[in-house]
Interface confidence: low
């Protein structure tokens, strides 16, 4: 139930008020408002639509509503000299050329600057060579290359098929390999869902059908000229030399149709498994190069893309708080798209809106919550979180000293099967209560709650009687505020059915077909899944704002610090005699878990039967949920990587997307078999235990009786 | 509807080996993971050992009692789960139960017997 | 390992009773807790997973409630076919364990 006080409200103006002013038709309008044009960052239309969400906003209610903009680093094809991939014959000869665009949908034919399918940031380069099927570019990808099957990428082109893990990765591990270009594409395997027709038709994608995207290794950093400092106007900037997570290598990507020509001609060894194999019909040989008669052809990729300082602008409004005006939860999506943005972002972006509209309604019938709820509409997440990341580093100080929680909004749907949730431990039980008071949107589930349909469809894999919910990982607006600022944070949208749908992601994911009517006439027609979502995102910035408690509960953290911690020893005890050789021990991190069990259950206990009257103690108890997130953070941050300072969970190092626990200790492990001196890579296991049980104890302290 | 079926069970002398076997119907067999849970005559539940899915790399695990000594392994091709039991022991006599994930199905067990 | 203590070992009961049987976890398990009846000569039959909710076809009858390391399985209106035997598991951490069992007898 939601605990909510008298902010100068009537009786009426509690979560249900809220909830029933949300509206599945605005959100069916907001949507197509935001879709009719392309909105890519650093653009004119999308200054244009900050300015239009800046004044709606305003209209809607909010206190204020303020544009902050930046100069930060993007990257555009060229006009004049498009990107595009060859084959050349033994006289240097184009005998095949890829596409240039898409096909546009119907109804989109007459619209102008719609950017051709590229990968943002990818350097110039004109290289040819043979090519070589690396699978997904994952790194066991290419271990089993480079280890099982002996083959050599050094000087290669590589072509990978898009999925299972962040592009980013895929690039970086080709460059390790040695790779001189890579070549990306969407494999019908993983881009095309069975019995499901091609879009318009259907939603599936169709041959000519590209993902765009960055392909930076930013590693939490923000704008690549001005790390760990906002590119504002007085901003030093480093040369693109120094620059965070640039590419080194041109990389492109393509459609399947332009992708079965590449392949259908390659040589070389045989997959080394089904799990090589795509849905083509080509042989999936690996190479290296084409095969006989085709042998003496090469591969020639022509890339003239720029990188350019642009200025982006995020809308930040504000909503203040009546009784703790000082405590920030905050609600962030993106606004950037990288064409018309049927799903990601305007999705969540028009969500978004129907929450601030409702806010706006009920602060407009003398409400106002608890605590001051800030709302934001990011630019350029789509070029590397730019937007999210430069504000937070503008106002670092505050956001660490105020910040209470983080709810992203990006895309409001990825399918329409069931709920997805990665969240904090802290925020487990707040999901869970608010999912049993929502009405589930499933057909087969009327009449009964969000949280019977979303359990039953998406059980926990592990722990019996509770639904999935995820680590997280970044790839989106939130990275900022977990990841760094050890801000509590989480995210919901509706996903698929990831047991009968293995394909990556949406099939249009990024593509010119991700339009209005996608959503309109296959995905969602009633959008009472959009309207599912607002309640849930909006239930939550309401809760975590208004409730007189926080609704966090450490002793769920507690819980998975221990399932993490088992995790980890188990992965170390793959290495026995190492262990012992090395005295490795994981006494410190067990001990430091079952501390924070203890003073968690005690802290729990006080918060049950503390006098809720006196606003001292309750502020007191209320920082102490508030600063427990940020009690995991490092301020040295993880190795190699400063901006990932959280000790319980970081990006994976293999794929951006995935969130790892104890990352520290788990990096420092990952095929250490492989280490040339096993003696200081296992001295840095030991180190990492060290932080990480260190942290974990000085996290439990943050808990105990102040005095 | 979901149904597993173990067989493989049998009298079997100290030291002897035993492979029982559990074909499971009636879901995606490939994304579950398998227990084996055994109960000695009169006796409580034990769990044996646990065999993940291939998202989750096959992973297995045991209990204590029977690691180096027990084998669970899976085909998820022919939706079975195995469970290869080496060095038995008279401790080993029980009935043998398969069950999907945390125990929710189980199966109607079969019965090993170890005895000179 | 974790050790799921079960109280009473056995409880003798008429139809239409209240029936009450706790588990008590050796440490923190969160509410990774389920409940099983089995009966002579069957399989045991999932009642209650994460400590609080009911499976399947399982009558509303049997509730369960409890986190971290108390738990307590509940049968109301004790019906004919509810004479079995009630154990605990966790399923927090490996090894999964179970309590003794619980025999609910006729009185």
């Known amino acids: 139930k939601s605990s909510n006080e008298a902010t100068n409200i009537t009786p009426k103006h509690n979560m249900k008020a809220f909830l029933d002013e949300l509206k599945a038709e605005n959100i069916k309008k907001f949507l197509y408002n935001f879709t009719q044009i392309p909105h890519l960052a650093g653009t004119e239309q999308n200054f244009q639509l900050a300015k239009q969400i800046q004044s709606q906003w305003k209209e809607f209610g909010l206190d204020s509503v303020e544009l902050a903009h930046y100069d930060v680093l993007l990257s555009y094809p060229n006009k004049t000299h498009p990107n595009y991939i060859s084959i050349i014959n033994e006289d240097g000869n184009e005998i095949f050329n890829t596409s240039l665009f898409e096909p546009p949908p119907p109804g989109y034919e007459n619209v102008s600057d719609i950017v051709p399918p590229f990968s943002a940031f990818s350097p110039q380069g004109m290289p040819e060579g043979d090519l070589v099927y690396v699978n997904y570019a994952r790194t066991e990808d290419f271990f089993k290359l480079e280890r099982d099957m002996k083959i050599n990428c050094s000087g290669k082109i590589v072509i990978a098929r898009y999925g299972k893990v962040f592009r980013g990765n895929k690039v970086k591990n080709a460059q390790l390999a040695g790779a001189k270009g890579v070549i990306l594409y969407s494999d019908p395997a993983d881009y095309f869902a069975p019995g499901v027709k091609s879009y318009p038709d259907g939603w599936n994608l169709p041959g000519g059908g590209v993902q765009r995207g960055n392909i930076l290794n930013l590693n939490g950093a923000g704008d690549p000229l001005t790390p760990g400092y906002p590119a504002n106007e007085y901003a030093y900037r480093r040369g693109i030399a120094e620059a965070v997570g640039l590419p080194s290598i041109p990389v492109h990507p393509i459609g399947y149709y332009d992708a079965q020509k590449l392949l259908e001609k390659m040589g070389g060894s045989a997959p080394p498994d089904s799990s090589w194999r795509g849905s083509l019909k080509v042989p999936y040989n690996v190479g290296p190069g084409f095969t006989g008669n085709f042998s003496t052809q090469k591969v020639k990729m022509h890339i003239h893309s720029t990188n350019e300082v642009t200025r982006i602008y995020n809308v930040i409004g504000t909503l203040r708080g009546a009784v703790e005006p000082d405590r920030y939860v905050i609600l962030g999506g993106h606004r950037d798209s990288w064409v018309f943005g049927g799903i990601d972002p305007q999705s969540g972006a028009a969500v978004v809106h129907e929450i601030v509209r409702s806010f706006g309604t009920l602060k407009k019938e003398g409400w106002r919550p608890r605590r001051t709820i800030l709302f934001a509409s990011w630019d350029a997440e789509e070029f590397g979180l730019l937007g999210s990341t430069e504000w937070a580093e503008e106002n670092s100080r505050l956001l660490q000293e105020r910040g209470v929680a983080y709810i992203n909004a990006d895309s409001s749907i990825e399918g329409n099967y069931t709920l997805r949730v990665d969240c904090t431990p802290l925020m487990y039980s707040l999901v869970h209560n608010l999912t049993k008071e929502l009405k589930s949107p499933d057909e087969g589930f009327e009449g009964k709650s969000l949280y019977e349909s979303w359990t039953k469809k998406s059980p926990s894999p592990e722990f019996s009687g509770m639904p999935r919910i995820s680590k997280l990982g970044s790839g989106n607006d939130f990275e900022v505020f977990f990841q760094r600022l050890g801000i509590a944070s989480g995210r919901a949208r509706y996903t698929k059915n990831w047991e009968t749908n293995k394909f990556s992601g949406y099939p249009l994911y990024h593509s010119v077909y991700e339009t209005y009517e996608l959503v309109e006439k296959f995905y969602d027609p009633m959008f009472k899944y959009h309207l599912t979502v607002a309640q849930v995102r909006g239930g939550m910035v309401f809760e975590l704002a208004n409730s007189i408690v926080l609704p966090f509960d450490c002793r769920d953290y507690a819980v998975v610090l221990r399932k993490y911690a088992d995790k980890i020893y188990s992965i170390s005890m793959k290495h026995p005699q190492e262990m012992k050789t090395y005295s490795v021990s994981f006494d410190s991190l067990f001990s430091a878990v079952k501390n924070f069990t203890e003073i968690a259950s005690k802290f729990s206990e006080r918060l049950q039967d503390f006098d809720k009257s006196n606003p001292i103690v309750l502020r007191m108890m209320n920082d102490q949920l508030m600063f427990l997130e940020r009690a995991f953070i490092d301020p040295l941050g993880l190795p190699d990587r400063p901006f990932y300072r959280h000790v319980i969970y970081a990006p994976s190092s293999h794929n951006k997307y995935a969130g790892e626990s104890f990352p520290g200790i788990y990096d420092a492990l990952f095929d250490i078999e492989s280490k040339v001196d096993p003696s200081k890579a296992w001295g840095e296991v030991k180190r990492q235990i060290y932080v990480a049980a260190f942290t974990v104890q000085a996290a439990a302290e943050t808990l105990s009786e102040v005095a | 509807e979901v149904k597993l079926v173990e067989s493989g069970g049998g009298l079997v002398q100290p030291g002897g080996s035993l492979k029982l076997s559990c074909a499971a119907s009636g879901f995606t067999f490939s994304n579950y993971w398998m227990n084996w849970v055994r109960q000695a005559s009169g006796k409580g539940l034990e769990w044996v050992a646990e065999?993940?899915?291939?998202?989750?790399?096959?992973?297995?695990h045991y209990a204590e009692s029977v690691k180096g000594r027990v084998i669970i392994s899976r085909d998820d091709s022919k939706n079975t789960v195995y469970l290869q039991m080496n060095s038995l022991r008279t401790e080993d006599t029980a009935v043998y139960y398969c069950?999907?994930?945390?125990?929710?199905?189980w199966g109607q067990g079969t019965t090993v017997t170890v005895s000179s | 390992d974790i050790q799921m203590t079960q109280s009473p070992s056995s409880v003798s009961a008429s139809v239409g009773d209240r029936v009450t049987i706790t588990c008590k976890a050796s440490e923190n398990v969160g509410t990774y807790v389920s409940w099983y009846q089995q009966k002579p000569g069957t399989a045991p039959k999932m009642l209650i997973y994460g400590a609080s909710n009911r499976f399947t076809g399982v009558p509303s009858r049997f509730s369960g409630s409890g986190s971290a390391t108390d738990f307590t399985l509940t049968i109301n209106n004790l019906q004919p076919e509810d004479f079995a035997t009630y154990y605990c598991?966790?399923?927090?951490?490996?090894?999964?364990?179970f309590g003794q069992g619980t025999k609910v007898e006729i009185k």
């Open positions: 065999i993940r899915s291939q998202s989750n790399n096959f992973a297995t």
């Open positions: 598991g966790q399923s927090y951490t490996f090894p999964y364990t």
């Open positions: 069950t999907r994930r945390w125990n929710n199905f």
